[in-house]
Structures are given as structure tokens and as C-alpha cells.
């Protein structure tokens, strides 16, 4: 058993039918010695008396808010949450496995640049009685500071019969140098509580591996005289690290017909312009990627050929 | 501690091409190692990230773009001094700081070259003959060093009398390749910046 925050305790349980459970001793936070009784949640049934209460915690019915009283007056509370260990693995019931880039990916994180700012998000099908708290650091043995905001509900989606809720959080490394070569990963820890169930999720990454630039901006077409060709030009996104000659991007230019089945023409360039043939009813899209470290491509920025 | 904006004319920077080749070569070698050593801890998540140049060179700090010198987090660096003549410096106006930066890159390459050659000698003794270092990568390191053309005493290749532990050698290869790829990215960024300045 360990303290999550004041008066909230997590009991770690080997979780299988008929498991023996854990013996927990609760102590009433009071100088009083006599006449103390204990109750659980809203029930008035007295579970025991005395300054301490010993309970065998085996299932969710044994968790909840334990209260010690004296003469009708509440002396203190202890909220017990359960952390299930199924076959030796901590349960992951609250969050949905996003399965990208691999199984057991519950947290996904992205950064728009090398400033040390990043966003993480996760999914759940649970809509009520749910709280999250997020901590982060650079490295774990001698952790350096990363400050995270509060997790917020950022999207709701309908998936088949289920509603899916997306939560996200923004974090900023306290003293980040964009040019630094990372040797210690960023660690992100999310505590999730649903009713009386506690779970924790972690993700470990280097900023360089989660880079996903914003799409190129100011995408423009300039027709070339007496030709079906057009000059496409664009600019680095505002959110990308500077100077651009140091933090260079590479670009992919795509000409896509109206039908998804039509052949796509693709050109790769380090410049911020390209000459392509604009077909009728086609659209031109451009996306960006770090020129030297192949992390994710940005989303496409698009303009119609017409 | 930074690169000045007044540097050689655009396109006149002979090291840019070599540094691009270097990044391509080390990335290919790392990919090959990860595929060949699939049952070894060779992914970025599995390895310890060690930097053999730590406390010996200070490439990131010495090659910091001018724009980032205002960022205090980029300036908590170590003092290191280097030899300061080199043929990538295509203009006499090149400052001492830029020479420091390029000589730091040269020292990095020299250190990695020695490590890779020592490691290759061990891998050639492996009866499994599972993986060797790509000769193209070693050649590209050499070409960039020649383009930088710093006079520096040669570091003798390390030789070991004891029987090599091939498992450990292959894991060390993965660690080295990951670290060298990261350094190659920095070198490419620096060369691109100098070329544009």
C-alpha cells in the first residue's frame, strides 16, 4: 500500500479469482484513543472499533472511503483504491491500446519542433468518474524538470457502438536547447483513476523521435506561360525551429487526381518550390519532414489545381 | 561558442556534400545492423545511449548557430581547445569559433573512425560472420576528414589481447552506430547552416 496523495492510498493486489488479497491496517488520524468506530462509504454499518482497523482487501467491494468517527463526528478519511496486477502485469483497463506504432501503446506523443514542448494524448471509452494526473521528467535516475499542464478532454468520437474520448496534455522541458543531442529520454507518467481503480501508464521517448512538423504554410501556385506546368511554392511552418538553415526540412510534393485510384505523382525536394504538371480537377499537396532525422511527415497542405 | 553569420559564400562549402554522404552511410549501416541483429538489443529503446566524444569534444556547443546563443540552456558547455587550420574554411574571414567548430567535428570523426576500425577487426574474427562494418561508411568518414584537413596526431588503433566477446561487441556496435548517427545529424545541420550563411 502507498499514498497517492493526502488521504488517498493505493493497494496493489495480485488479481485472479480466489487470490488471497492484502492485509491493510488503517489508522485514524486523531489524538483520540477511545470510542472510535469505522464505516465504509455511505454505509452506517460499523466495521470495527479502535484507533486502527485491519481489513483484508481482495476485491473492489473492499475498496472505497473508510471513515473513522467518534460520537457522530467524523475524525478522518482514508480512500482506498485498487491497482490490479493480473498475472504479474499491471492492468490497463482504463486506456485504450492505440496499437500504433506497436501493441501496448497507450500514450502517444508528438512535438512540432525541438523547443522541448510536446503534446501527449490517450483514448478511453470511459465517460464518467475518471481523473488523470500527468508528470514528466528528462531521465529517471537523476530527473531533470519537465512541466506538464492539466489533462483535458480534447475530442469525442463515435467508434461503432462505442463513444471514444481523447484526452491530451501539453508539457514543456524546463531548460531545453533545440540543438542538443539527447542522451536521456523524456519520461511521461500518467496516473488514471476510474471509480476505485488506479492504473498508471508510462511512455519514454526522445524529442527527436516524436517530431512531426506542422504542414507547410502559404502554399501557392503560379502557372508557367505556355505550359501545363505550374510552380508550387510554400514556406516553413511558423512553429518549426529556427534557424531554418540549421533545422532544415525536406518536402514531398504530390499531384493527386480527384479519384483515389489515379496515379499519384510525387516529387521530393529540399527547396521551398517545385515545378509540377497540374492536371484538371487535381490537387497539389505538400508535406514536410526533418531533412536529417527521419521522424514523422507532417500532415498535407493542399490547394486545388484550378 | 557560436557560428558567425559571415562565413563562406553559398555553395562554396566543400564539406556539405561529404556530410550528407556520411549521414546516408551511417543511417544505412544502422538499418542493416538492426535487421541483422534482430535478436540483439539494437533499437533506440533497448540500448544505452553513450557518447564516446563526451568530455573530449564539444561539437554541439562549438557549432551552435548564432541565433541559439541567446538560449541559456544551450550555453552550459565545457571549454575545449582545438587545432585551428582546415581546408573547409574557404574564406580567410572565417572566425576562430568556426575553426573550433570544424576541428571539433574532425576530432569526432577521428574518434569514431578508431572505434569502428577496432570493432571491425573483432567482428572479422567472429565465426558466425554475422555483421561487418560497411566499407563505404568508413570511406565516407575518411573523405570528410580529408575535406576538413586538420593536422592532428594519429590515434593508434586499439588492440586487445583477450578473446573478444562477440555478443558484447555487437551490442557495442549498435550503441556506437546510434550515437554516430545522432552526431552525423548535428554535423549535417552545421554544414547546412554554414553553407547558407
Amino acid at each position: 500500500i502507498w499514498e497517492l496523495k493526502k488521504d488517498v492510498y493505493v493497494v496493489e493486489l495480485d488479481w485472479y479469482p480466489d487470490a488471497p488479497g492484502e492485509m491493510v491496517v488503517l489508522t485514524c488520524d486523531t489524538p483520540e484513543e477511545d470510542g472510535i468506530t469505522w464505516t465504509l462509504d455511505q454505509s452506517s454499518e460499523v466495521l470495527g472499533s479502535g484507533k486502527t482497523l485491519t481489513i483484508q482487501v481482495k476485491e473492489f467491494g473492499d475498496a472505497g472511503q473508510y471513515t473513522c468517527h467518534k460520537g457522530g463526528e467524523v475524525l478522518s478519511h482514508s480512500l482506498l483504491l485498487l491497482h490490479k496486477k493480473e498475472d504479474g502485469i499491471w492492468s490497463t483497463d482504463i486506456l485504450k491500446d492505440q496499437k500504433e506504432p506497436k501493441n501496448k501503446t497507450f500514450l502517444r506523443c508528438e512535438a512540432k519542433n525541438y523547443s522541448g514542448r510536446f503534446t501527449c494524448w490517450w483514448l478511453t471509452t470511459i465517460s464518467t468518474d475518471l481523473t488523470f494526473s500527468v508528470k514528466s521528467s528528462r531521465g529517471s535516475s537523476d530527473p531533470q524538470g519537465v512541466t506538464c499542464g492539466a489533462a483535458t478532454l480534447s475530442a469525442e468520437r463515435v467508434r461503432g457502438d462505442n463513444k471514444e474520448y481523447e484526452y491530451s496534455v501539453e508539457c514543456q522541458e524546463d531548460s531545453a536547447c533545440p540543438a542538443a543531442e539527447e542522451s536521456l529520454p523524456i519520461e511521461v507518467m500518467v496516473d488514471a483513476v476510474h471509480k476505485l481503480k488506479y492504473e498508471n501508464y508510462t511512455s519514454s521517448f526522445f524529442i527527436r523521435d516524436i517530431i512531426k512538423p506542422d504542414p507547410p504554410k502559404n502554399l501557392q501556385l503560379k502557372p508557367l506561360k505556355n505550359s501545363r506546368q505550374v510552380e508550387v511554392s510554400w514556406e516553413y511552418p511558423d512553429t518549426w525551429s529556427t534557424p531554418h538553415s540549421y533545422f532544415s526540412l525536406t518536402f514531398c510534393v504530390q499531384v493527386q487526381g480527384k479519384s483515389k485510384r489515379e496515379k499519384k505523382d510525387r516529387v521530393f525536394t529540399d527547396k521551398t518550390s517545385a515545378t509540377v504538371i497540374c492536371r484538371k480537377n487535381a490537387s497539389i499537396s505538400v508535406r514536410a519532414q526533418d531533412r536529417y532525422y527521419s521522424s514523422s511527415w507532417s500532415e498535407w497542405a493542399s490547394v486545388p489545381c484550378s | 561558442r557560436n557560428l558567425p553569420v559571415a562565413t563562406p559564400d553559398p555553395g562554396m562549402f566543400p564539406c556539405l556534400h561529404h556530410s550528407q554522404n556520411l549521414l546516408r552511410a551511417v543511417s544505412n549501416m544502422l538499418q542493416k545492423a538492426r535487421q541483422t541483429l534482430e535478436f540483439y538489443p539494437c533499437t533506440s529503446e533497448e540500448i544505452d545511449h553513450e557518447d564516446i566524444t563526451k568530455d573530449k569534444t564539444s561539437t554541439v556547443e562549438a557549432c551552435l548557430p548564432l541565433e541559439l546563443t541567446k538560449n541559456e540552456s544551450c550555453l552550459n558547455s565545457r571549454e575545449t581547445s582545438f587545432i585551428t587550420n582546415g581546408s573547409c574554411l574557404a574564406s580567410r574571414k572565417t572566425s576562430f569559433m568556426m575553426a573550433l567548430c570544424l576541428s571539433s567535428i574532425y576530432e569526432d570523426l577521428k574518434m569514431y573512425q578508431v572505434e569502428f576500425k577496432t570493432m571491425n577487426a573483432k567482428l572479422l574474427m567472429d565465426p558466425k560472420r554475422q555483421i561487418f562494418l560497411d566499407q563505404n561508411m568508413l570511406a565516407v568518414i575518411d573523405e570528410l576528414m580529408q575535406a576538413l584537413n586538420f593536422n592532428s596526431e594519429t590515434v593508434p588503433q586499439k588492440s586487445s589481447l583477450e578473446e573478444p566477446d562477440f555478443y558484447k561487441t555487437k551490442i557495442k556496435l549498435c550503441i556506437l552506430l546510434h550515437a554516430f548517427r545522432i552526431r552525423a545529424v548535428t554535423i549535417d545541420r552545421v554544414m547546412s547552416y554554414l553553407n547558407a550563411s
Epitope: W15, D18, D87, D93, K96, I126 | -
Partner: antibody, heavy 112, light 107 residues
Framework: EVQLVESGGGLVQPGGSLRLSCAAS????????MVWVRQAPGKGLEWVAS????????YYADTVKGRFTISRDNAKNTLYLQMNSLRAEDTAVYYC?????WGQGTLVTVSS | DIQMTQSPSSLSASVGDRVTITCKAS??????VAWYQQKPGKAPKGLIY???HRYSGVPDRFSGSGSGTDFTLTISSLQPEDFATYYC?????????FGGGTKVEIK
């Protein structure tokens, strides 16, 4: 007493469908992840699919992905395995399990 | 996928013998290994989880050990009811995979 009882097995033609059920009792079913495991005649054990307590996380073996669907109804204390496009190699005894307890199994025979 | 290689595939032993079955994972699985017992015509039954933890009610003559890639199930003193087939399983990553089984027969 913990009990897991499978049903729904039988003889089916290749390409056909079956729905297996597993009735759970003796424990709080809704608090536990569940799995289906199968055993071809005279062979070893093969994991088929897993589902978390609240159905948010589901995993399948590659051999059944896209053909089988694991689901559960916590109100009915029942685990299901919907099997479509059945093949001869799906012939096996199918067990539902929540360690350390396994059901007695139900035999699925796919044959023309 | 992670392969679990169990050995031996069968063994003959007498009541009172100490029996050791080994299981080798093709890559590191930490301690996420379970052991099962299956008697002819019956369903398997869980014995060990997390490589070395016995489920409640499992006799203490059964013990498990190991981590990483090498795991062992030991029966310290074989009893008549222990003649069965034993399987190891890794659940470190999906797909979950079982060993081929070890049949423990009466000598």
C-alpha cells in the same frame, strides 16, 4: 466456487460460422480480463484472443484476425467468440480462461 | 513473434523424483511467463505466474524460476497426481505464445 462453462461448439462446414459462449460464475466477472485458447486434437495450446475487463482492449492471434470476434456481456457474466469463415485448421477444443481457471472446453469441428 | 522452446518434450520419472522442465524464449520476456498443467482429457490449470509465483492452492512442491529468456519449472518431489503435460507461456507481448509441452510419464 469459480466456474467457466463453454458452449456452442459443434460440426460446421468450411466457410461457416459458430458462436461460442462461456458462462462465468463464482467471481466478479466484470473485473477480470478473459482469454480464448484452443487446442487442436493431439496438439499443444494456441492462444486465440484476449479481452480486457471493460472490453476497451482486444487482441487476436494473426491466424484468426478478421475472422473471429471476442466480446463480453458483463451484465450476463458471459464471454463470447464469434467465429466466421471457418477453416479445417480451426478444428480444436476451445477453452475460455481466467487464470488459473479454465473451462472444460467445447469442441469445434470444421469439415465438409 | 516470440518462440517458446520447451525441453524435454517428454520424460519418465518415478514418484518422489525431482523433475525439472525448461523453457527458452527467443527474446527477452522479463518475468512474464506462466506454467500450466494439463491432464489427459482435461482442461489446463494455471500453476505459476510471473515466472515464480504460485497461484493460491497450488502445492509448494511446484516452483518456477528464471527471467529474461531462460525459465524453469521444478517439481521437488513428484506425486502420482503430477503425471501430466506441462506448458510454459509468455505473455510479455502479443501474440501470447506457448511452449510445445513436456509430457511427464511414469517410469
Amino acid at each position: 466456487e469459480v466456474q467457466l462453462v463453454e458452449s456452442g461448439g459443434g460440426l460446421v462446414q468450411p466457410g461457416g460460422s459458430l458462436r461460442l459462449s462461456c458462462a462465468a460464475s463464482g467471481f466478479t466477472f466484470s473485473d477480470y480480463g478473459m482469454v480464448w485458447v484452443r487446442q487442436a486434437p493431439g496438439k499443444g495450446l494456441e492462444w486465440v484472443a484476449s479481452i480486457s475487463s471493460g472490453s476497451s482492449n482486444i487482441y487476436y492471434a494473426d491466424t484468426v484476425k478478421g475472422r473471429f470476434t471476442i466480446s463480453r456481456d458483463n451484465a450476463k457474466n458471459t464471454l463470447y467468440l464469434q467465429m466466421n469463415s471457418l477453416r479445417a485448421e480451426d478444428t480444436a477444443v476451445y477453452y475460455c480462461a481466467r487464470n488459473p481457471y479454465w473451462g472444460q472446453g467445447t469442441l469445434v469441428t470444421v469439415s465438409s | 513473434d516470440i518462440q517458446m522452446t520447451q525441453s524435454p518434450s517428454s520424460l519418465s520419472a518415478s514418484v518422489g523424483d525431482r523433475v525439472t522442465i525448461t523453457c527458452k524464449a527467443s527474446q527477452n520476456v522479463g518475468t512474464n511467463v506462466a506454467w500450466y498443467q494439463q491432464k489427459p482429457g482435461k482442461a489446463p490449470k494455471g500453476l505459476i505466474y510471473s515466472a515464480s509465483h504460485r497461484y493460491s492452492g497450488v502445492p509448494d512442491r511446484f516452483s518456477g524460476s528464471g527471467s529474461g529468456t531462460d525459465f524453469t519449472l521444478t517439481i521437488s518431489s513428484l506425486q502420482p497426481e503430477d503425471f501430466a503435460t506441462y506448458y510454459c507461456q509468455q505473455y510479455n507481448s502479443y501474440p501470447l505464445t506457448f511452449g510445445g509441452g513436456t509430457k511427464v510419464e511414469i517410469k
